[in-house]
Amino acid sequence: LIQERRSHEVNPAAHLTGANSSLTGSGGPLLWETQLGLAFLRGLSYHDGALVVTKAGYYYIYSKVQLGGVGCPLGLASTITHGLYKRTPRYPEELELLVSQQSPCGRATSSSRVWWDSSFLGGVVHLEAGEEVVVRVLDERLVRLRDGTRSYFGAFMV
Amino acid sequence: LIQERRSHEVNPAAHLTGANSSLTGSGGPLLWETQLGLAFLRGLSYHDGALVVTKAGYYYIYSKVQLGGVGCPLGLASTITHGLYKRTPRYPEELELLVSQQSPCGRATSSSRVWWDSSFLGGVVHLEAGEEVVVRVLDERLVRLRDGTRSYFGAFMV
Amino acid sequence: LIQERRSHEVNPAAHLTGANSSLTGSGGPLLWETQLGLAFLRGLSYHDGALVVTKAGYYYIYSKVQLGGVGCPLGLASTITHGLYKRTPRYPEELELLVSQQSPCGRATSSSRVWWDSSFLGGVVHLEAGEEVVVRVLDERLVRLRDGTRSYFGAFMV
């Protein structure tokens, strides 16, 4: 998988930001803003929450999500899972790439205590043209959106 | 915003480290070491806590701060905000780029309990020549400096 | 330390993943998978837990470790230290590069409470050919390995 980066080519990169529509409650991946504010796509495409690779190579992919709450919602598991997942033409199911588990509710020592936590993931993965990367958070009820600076998703070729 | 990286040019990068002088208590941004130890500037400038862009493009910017304390200082808000902010000649106020909120004090179940926490931010943003990026932490009283390895600030063009 | 990236050269990069053999309990650094699954080496070498630099330059190095437990093991310090360290032929001891301290056990308000936490480190450092970078976690008893997606270690030249 030797890969070269030519000096006359634009290096693929993207930064997508959280928006009011990010949390669907449908069990699908988080959705993202691709154009407004800090968001952009350069040499990558976007579809329904997914960054779509148009040029094969090694990419540093990253995501941060802002978590927060008052105590813990009834029935909420003590673990929040935040992950980056790959969809590939060669396999029908999503593949885990980078994943974190956190127990942020444990910070609140009383049921009325406000708490905040943040989860950051980043790492280099090989992606082929046509493959897609998505962000998932379980349970997404604890994701706190505001202005695109606290929850985001991005990538660039290395 | 098409941007190319020429093979004969040095790719801008910097890594600045925390120092005793980083915390000013003045309400300004954190200050950083730019030369000693692990710190360096390559194709970027520095001024009063700010990384100053000399070449327009997309940059992966990042910062980590080490937080710690014994219980929680009286009157401290339950939220710590750690952020990267942009100053631009085109707008009078700082613009939020990447921000995290955390409630690390909630980890300490007694007022005499020692606790540590860390906040990491990183993401790709477009920066014009002359624009500046700074790091702010509110409340900075909980930032724990030591030797430049626990709190730092950096960037590189992607 | 002027460094250029030639368009005809492969840019050094690596992503190493956690495996059952990662935790040795010997006081040494964590060990990593270098070939299977998501793991790869491109223009970097590996030896006994260390990424070995074959081409001098500035590298963004990163590591994430997944922490977890049930309450806190007896005798466990309230602080977990996760760090990236450099070994150089020019100095007999390892040098700290990027370090985080966390107190994740403090999240569990009872001794039988399950908790999870994650620590991420990333930053740009200058590395010479022959120098090595390792990951250490103290106390490594709280590192939770699974499938290579939760604890990992990587680098790429910037």
Epitope: L1, I2, R6, H47, A50, R90, P92, E128 | - | -
Partner: antibody, heavy 116, light 107 residues
Framework: QVQLVESGGGLVKPGGSLRLSCAAS????????MSWIRQAPGKGLEWVSY???????YYSESVKGRFTISRDNAKNSLYLQMNSLRAEDTAVYYC??????????WGQGTLVTVSS | DIQMTQSPSSLSASVGDRVTITCRAS??????LAWFQQKPGKAPKSLIY???SLQSGVPSKFSGSGSGTDFTLTISSLQPEDFATYFC?????????FGPGTKVDIK
């Protein structure tokens, strides 16, 4: 075994429309990315469009804004709606399944002729 | 777009000959290269993917090699059923592009 059968080709005037279909069998259609490729008479091959499992869609510049790819997983079918047809769209159109590489399995093709 | 060129554009060979076709990409495509065989009036058939991996059911007389910009398809011992046109195709970068083809006919 994997089978892809195209239909819907024919003679159409410039500016006209056609809808091509590709009936798939022998595999779980919804699990796969699917493509359309065309070959002008006596010429080379050109990738026209693809649709991913999640319905991400890509078009070549030559057909963007005129052609629409779609899929019906319940019917194991792939479609290509072709509008504003031009003489240069005359070709044999193939559907193909993407697995180990983008065009692993091909149908037999259907001929589209655009002429006045 | 990445341009794919093939050489020769045509060649005449005899049964039993070893035949080599080359394909060159206008920029590096790693190993993201496929080879296809097409007979008159028929659909292309995939022979090789990832530059050197044989598709299931394809006889081992076909082999591929190369990486970066230069690739070859070799037929170790040409048989009557191998007289056809051969195309290379890159799938490193959108849009995926094909070579113009190499026609192999009987000497």
């Amino acid at each position: 075994q994997v089978q892809l059968v195209e239909s819907g080709g024919g003679l159409v005037k410039p500016g006209g429309s056609l809808r091509l279909s590709c009936a798939a069998s022998g595999f779980t259609f919804s699990d796969y990315y699917m493509s359309w490729i065309r070959q002008a008479p006596g010429k080379g091959l050109e990738w026209v469009s693809y649709i991913s499992r999640s319905s991400f869609i890509y078009y070549s510049e030559s057909v963007k804004g005129r052609f629409t790819i779609s899929r019906d997983n319940a019917k194991n079918s792939l479609y290509l709606q072709m509008n504003s047809l031009r003489a240069e769209d005359t070709a044999v159109y193939y559907c193909a399944r993407w697995e180990l590489s983008p065009f692993d399995y091909w149908g037999q093709g259907t001929l589209v002729t655009v002429s006045s | 777009d990445i341009q794919m060129t093939q050489s020769p554009s045509s060649l005449s060979a005899s049964v039993g000959d070893r035949v080599t076709i080359t394909c060159r990409a206008s920029q590096g495509i790693s190993n993201y290269l496929a080879w296809f065989q097409q007979k008159p009036g028929k659909a292309p058939k995939s022979l090789i993917y990832a530059a050197s991996s044989l598709q299931s059911g394809v006889p081992s007389k076909f082999s591929g090699s190369g990486s970066g910009t230069d690739f070859t398809l070799t037929i170790s011992s040409l048989q009557p059923e191998d007289f056809a046109t051969y195309f290379c195709q890159q799938y490193n970068t959108y849009p995926f592009t094909f070579g113009p083809g190499t026609k192999v006919d009987i000497k």
